[in-house]
C-alpha cells in the first residue's frame, strides 16, 4: 500500500523538516528559516511561534518542531501550550480586574496564582480549629471537641482497642 501511495503521491516521501514544493516539480525542499514541518508529506511548512514580550523561549524552533514558550519571571503560563501569561500575585492575594488584592477574611491563597479559597470549616467534620487560618494558610483542624475532654490528649490518639498490649508513648 505504501508503495502504491508513493507512486500516486510523490509528496508522501517528503520527510518532516521538508515540504513538497509544487513550484519545483514536487521535490522535497527544506523548510525555510523560521518555519517547520513536524510530519512528512506536508505541502507547506508552518511559521515558527515567536516568544516575544512577556513570553520567553523555552525551546527553540527547529525544522521539525515548533518553538515552545514560557513566561518571563513574575508571570505564569495559562492555556494549552502556554498561550497566555498571567501576572503573579503574592501569597495571600488573588488577581482581580483591579490587580492583586488581599484575600478577604475567611479565605486564603497559598500560591502566587489562582483565587482565594474559603478556609476549611472544621465543624463540618465534627472537628475543632487547632490553628487559625490566615490570608496565606488554611486553618488546621484538630480533634473533635468531644476528644478534648479532661484527661484526653489532644496530640496522641487513644490506643486502638484491638491492641490490648499497646499503650500510648
Amino acid at each position: 500500500f505504501e508503495r502504491t501511495r508513493s507512486l500516486q503521491d510523490p509528496c508522501s516521501n517528503c520527510p518532516a523538516g521538508t515540504f513538497c514544493d509544487n513550484n519545483r516539480n514536487q521535490i522535497c525542499s527544506p523548510c525555510p528559516p523560521n518555519s517547520f514541518s513536524s510530519a512528512g508529506g506536508q505541502r507547506t511548512c508552518d511559521i515558527c511561534r515567536q516568544c516575544k514580550g512577556v513570553f520567553r523561549t523555552r525551546k527553540e524552533c527547529s525544522s521539525t518542531s515548533n518553538a515552545e514558550c514560557d513566561c518571563t519571571p513574575g508571570f505564569h503560563c495559562l492555556g494549552a501550550g502556554c498561550s497566555m501569561c498571567e501576572q503573579d500575585c503574592k501569597q495571600g492575594q488573588e488577581l482581580t480586574k483591579k490587580g492583586c488584592k488581599d484575600c478577604c477574611f475567611g479565605t486564603f491563597n497559598d500560591q502566587k496564582r489562582g483565587i482565594c479559597r474559603p478556609w476549611t470549616n472544621c465543624s463540618l467534620d465534627g472537628k475543632s480549629v487547632l490553628v487559625n487560618g490566615t490570608k496565606e494558610r488554611d486553618v488546621v483542624c484538630g480533634p473533635s471537641p468531644a476528644d478534648l475532654s479532661p484527661g484526653a490528649s489532644s496530640v496522641t490518639p487513644p490506643a486502638p482497642a484491638r491492641e490490648p498490649g499497646h499503650s500510648p508513648q
Epitope: K52, G53, F55, C82
Partner: nanobody
Amino acid sequence: EVQLVESGGGLVQPGGSLRLSCAASGFTFSSSAMSWARQAPGKGLEWVSGIYSGGSTYYTESVKDRFTISRDNAKNTLYLQMNSLRPEDTAVYYCATWGTLRFGVWAEYDHWGQGTLVTVSS
C-alpha cells in the same frame, strides 16, 4: 506588519513628569485594547496599565493617581502620562496590544514594541 514604536523616555528628576507615546500601525488601533508594561533593571516584567477600545482604564496599584493612560485613535497613538516620578519607576517601558482584556494577562498573539528607557534620578 504590526508595528509599535515607543518614544518619550529619558532622564528625569524625582517628582518630575514625562509623557510616553506609542505610535501604532499595521492593525485597527481604534478597536484594539492597549497596554503598558515595564521592566526595571535586573527585575521581571510588570503590567503597568491598560486601556480598552472604549476608553476604560486600569492601573497597577503602585502607579495609581500618578500615571494616566490615554489614546488618540485619530493619530493611532497610545500615551502614558507619568507624574510624581520616583526612582523605583526607572525601567524600560513597553507598549503592547492587550487582546485578553484581563488585568495582568497577555496572549501569544499580542504585539510588543521595542521599549523606551525612563530613568528617574537626581
